[in-house]
Amino acid sequence: EPTMYGEILSPNYPQAYPSEVEKSWDIEVPEGYGIHLYFTHLDIELSENCAYDSVQIISGDTEEGRLCGQRSSNNPHSPIVEEFQVPYNKLQVIFKSDFSNEERFTGFAAYYVATDINECTDFVDVPCSHFCNNFIGGYFCSCPPEYFLHDDMKNCGVNCSGDVFTALIGEIASPNYPKPYPENSRCEYQIRLEKGFQVVVTLRREDFDVEAADSAGNCLDSLVFVAGDRQFGPYCGHGFPGPLNIETKSNALDIIFQTDLTGQKKGWKLRYHGDPMPCPKEDTPNSVWEPAKAKYVFRDVVQITCLDGFEVVEGRVGATSFYSTCQSNGKWSNSKLKCQPVDCGIPESIENGKVEDPESTLFGSVIRYTCEEPYYYMENGGGGEYHCAGNGSWVNEVLGPELPKCVPVCGVPREPFEEKQR
Amino acid sequence: IIGGSDADIKNFPWQVFFDNPWAGGALINEYWVLTAAHVVEGNREPTMYVGSTSVQTSRLAKSKMLTPEHVFIHPGWKLLEVPEGRTNFDNDIALVRLKDPVKMGPTVSPICLPGTSSDYNLMDGDLGLISGWGRTEKRDRAVRLKAARLPVAPLRKCKEVKVEKPTADAEAYVFTPNMICAGGEKGMDSCKGDSGGAFAVQDPNDKTKFYAAGLVSWGPQCGTYGLYTRVKNYVDWIMKTMQENSTPRED
C-alpha cells in the first residue's frame, strides 16, 4: 500500500547488525509523486566497491547507489549524511552483510518522503504535445484554440476525422488547405461507395505539399490510402510522388493523413469518383463471348456460348451456353463453368452386333459397329461408323443417330449338302 | 424323305422340327417360322426345335426350343371338320410368331424368301433341296435329318400319279397355280412328317444363297411326285403379316 513517508533501519539498529544478513525494503509512494530518500546515520563495514557489507538503492533496473563506511553530515544544520531523489514512485533498498565483521558496526537509519515531481520539466521526453500544467501529484496537458486533446490526454490535434463520403464524385483536402495543415494530427476520411463501384482517386502534382521524408526515407508527415488489404503510400514531399490516377479496385477507401509536431506545409487536395468495377476479360477456351467488348464493368452480362463440340457441364446436364455477370467484387459469376468437350458416353449396345470400345468418347471420336458375321449383316447401311457429334449423340453419315440393325443372313448353310451315293 | 441321304443340320440350318404333329418348318427370321397350314391347324401352340440334326429326345433337350406366341394361318386355307379327308391343299401356308428371337449361328439361320421378280419363277427341271425327319423307306419317322435334291416337274406329272390311299375319288383333289410339283427322279420325294419344310432353291441372283421356293404340302404317293406350296405367291401376305405383328425391336 503506497505511503507518503517512512523509516528504514538496519537490523538491531542502533545495536550492531548481525553477520550474514540480507534484507530488502520496497518503498512505494502514490502515483504522480517522486521519492526523497535520505540517511541520517551510516556505519557499515568499509570495503572496496562495498563488496563485504552494503546498503543498495535500486530504482527499476537502475542502481541509484551503493553505500558503506561511515558518513557524517557536511551541514551543521542538517542531520542528512546521504540522500537520493528519484522521479519515480517505487524504490527498493537492500541491506547485505557478510559472514564476519572486524569491528562492531551499527548500520544505518534512513527516511523517505513522497515529493512532488514536475512532469513538465523533470523528464527528457515532454509529456504534452502543446501545453503542460504541473500540480502536486500529477500534471495535465492542454491545447491551443481549435485544437482538442486526444484520448491519450497528451496530444493535441485538430478535429479532422469522421467524414464519410458516399457521393459518386467528390473533393477532399487537408485541413486549412491551402494554408498550412495542423501539426500532430491524424485525419481519417472514409469514402464508401455503392458495391460494384471502385474508388478512383486523382491528384495533381502541384496540389500536394507535405513535409518531406527524413534521411532514412521515412515520411514525417504522410498521406496513406487504404482499400481493403491494399495500401497506397505513404506519400510525402513537394509534389505528389505517386500515380496521378489511383484505381483502388474497391468501393471503400480510407484516407489517413498523419502529421507530426514540426514542419507544416500547405497540404493536399484530391478528387475522387466512382467507376463501375471492371471485370477482366477472362480466357475461356472453346467459347465465344456475346457481346464482345474491350472492357467489361459492373452489371455487364455476357452470354458465353461453347463452340460446336463443347458444352458446359453444370451438375450432370450439358448445356451449350451460360450467362455470366460482372459482379460488384470485380469477379464474374459462374466463373467455375467451363466449356469442355462433349462426352457422348458409352455407345449403345446393339443386338447381334458389337461396338469396339473407343479410345475416347469425346467430341470427334469415332466408333465402329459390326454385326456378328457370318450370321448377321448390317441391314440399314451406313457402314457402321459413327462419330461423337456436337449434340452429344453418336452420329452416322447416312443414318444419323439411328443405330445400325444387324439382321440374320438368310439362305447360307454352313456346309453344303452332298448327296451320298447309294 | 424317300430316297434321300443323311444330312447335317449345318446343311439346312433353317430346318425347324415340330414334334406334334411330327412335321417341319422353315425359319425365315429371328421371330418367324414358315410352315404348312395343315401342320398347325390342329395345334395352335406347337413346340418347335432348331439347331439339332437328331430329334432323339436326349438330343432335343440340348437343342434350342422355340415357343410360339401366335399362329397365323393363311386366310385362304379352308378349315375342315374332318381334316383327314382333305382333298384341297390350296393356300397350305402358315406363319408362327415366336415369343423370343432366335439367336443365329452355324446350326441355326434363316432361309431367304423368294423375290417378287420373274427371276424367281420356277422352270421345270430347276433343282431344289428338301429336308426333314419324316417317313423314309425304312421307318415311319427319321431320327436323323434326311435330305434330297429333286427337280421341279410340270403340275400334270403330279396329277397323273394315282393317290395311294384316297379318302375321296381322284377328281376331288385340287391342283392350283399355288402349288409346285417336284420329284419323280430316282424315287426321291418328301413324305408324311416332312410337311412344312422348305423346298430350297438356289437364288438366281446370288448362288451362295437358298430361298424357300416351296413348302412340303401333300402328295399322291410317297416316292413319286410331291406338291409344294408356291411361296412366291404368298410373299406379300408373309411380309404384311410379319409387319403388322412385329415389335419395335424388329422394326
Partner: antibody, heavy 118, light 109 residues
Framework: EVMLVESGGGLVKPGGSLRLSCAAS????????MSWVRQAPGKGLEWVAT????????YYLDSVKGRFTISRDNSKDTLYLQMNSLRAEDTALYYC???????????WGQGTLVTVSS | QIVLTQSPATLSLSPGERATLSCTAS???????LHWYQQKPGKAPKLWIY???NLASGVPSRFSGSGSGTDYTLTISSLQPEDFATYYC??????????FGQGTKLEIK
C-alpha cells in the same frame, strides 16, 4: 438363355473391403456394357457404376467415386465390383445388369447382399 | 442430375381396373432412354417397357407406355392378379448417372 449370377457379398465392418463378381452366360459378354445397381433394404433402386463393353470406360455414382472400382474380364465372361472404405450406407442388395439398346437394363442377376456393420 | 419422381407412391386397385402410373423428370428426358421395370418381393427387377412404349419380351399387351419430355406414363388396361408389384421408371442421360424413380407400389385393394 441369358444368365447373370452375382457372388461375393457378405458382412463387413465399416472401412472394410469386398469384391463382388457377376458371372455371365448365354450371350456374347464382350459385346455389352454392364452396370451394377443396388437396392438398400426396403428402398428403391440406385445405379452404382457402368463399364463399357471393352472395359476402357467407367462411370460411377458420385458417392462411391474413389471407393468402388468396376472392372471386367471378357475372357472369363465376368464383371467385378471392388468396394473399399465401405460405409453403413453401402448396405444393400447388389445386382449386376446388362445394358441393352437405349441403355435399358434388359437382364439382371438375382443379387448379392452386402451388409456393412460394426 | 435428372431426378425422376413417381406418383402415386402406392396405388390400391382391384383386378380388372385400369392402372395409371406416372413418372415425372426434373428436366427433359429422351423418350428412347426412358424405361420401366417390374419388381416383385424378393426378386430381381425385370425390364418391362423400354424406350417409353416398347413392351419387353413376354410382357402382356394390356401394358402400355407413353410420354415425352418430362412426363411419362405406364398404363395397365385391366389389372390381373400377377400385375401387382412395384414398378420403377429409369432414365439414362449420356452424362451418368442413370437414375431411377422411387417406385410405385401397385397393391390389391
Amino acid at each position: 438363355e441369358v444368365m447373370l449370377v452375382e457372388s461375393g457379398g457378405g458382412l463387413v465392418k465399416p472401412g472394410g473391403s469386398l469384391r463382388l463378381s457377376c458371372a455371365a452366360s448365354g450371350f456374347t459378354f464382350s459385346n455389352y456394357a454392364m452396370s451394377w445397381v443396388r437396392q438398400a433394404p426396403g428402398k428403391g433402386l440406385e445405379w452404382v457404376a457402368t463399364i463399357s463393353s471393352g472395359g476402357s470406360h467407367t462411370y460411377y455414382l458420385d458417392s462411391v467415386k474413389g471407393r468402388f472400382t468396376i472392372s471386367r474380364d471378357n475372357s472369363k465372361d465376368t464383371l467385378y465390383l471392388q468396394m473399399n472404405s465401405l460405409r453403413a450406407e453401402d448396405t444393400a442388395l447388389y445386382y449386376c445388369a446388362r445394358l441393352f439398346t437405349g441403355y435399358a437394363m434388359d437382364y439382371w442377376g438375382q443379387g448379392t447382399l452386402v451388409t456393412v456393420s460394426s | 442430375q435428372i431426378v425422376l419422381t413417381q406418383s402415386p407412391a402406392t396405388l390400391s386397385l382391384s383386378p380388372g381396373e385400369r392402372a395409371t402410373l406416372s413418372c415425372t423428370a426434373s428436366s427433359s428426358v429422351s423418350s428412347s432412354y426412358l424405361h420401366w421395370y417390374q419388381q416383385k418381393p424378393g426378386k430381381a427387377p425385370k425390364l418391362w417397357i423400354y424406350s417409353t412404349s416398347n413392351l419387353a419380351s413376354g410382357v402382356p399387351s394390356r401394358f402400355s407406355g407413353s410420354g415425352s419430355g418430362t412426363d411419362y406414363t405406364l398404363t395397365i388396361s385391366s389389372l390381373q392378379p400377377e400385375d401387382f408389384a412395384t414398378y420403377y421408371c429409369h432414365q439414362y442421360y449420356r452424362l451418368p448417372p442413370h437414375t431411377f424413380g422411387q417406385g410405385t407400389k401397385l397393391e390389391i385393394k
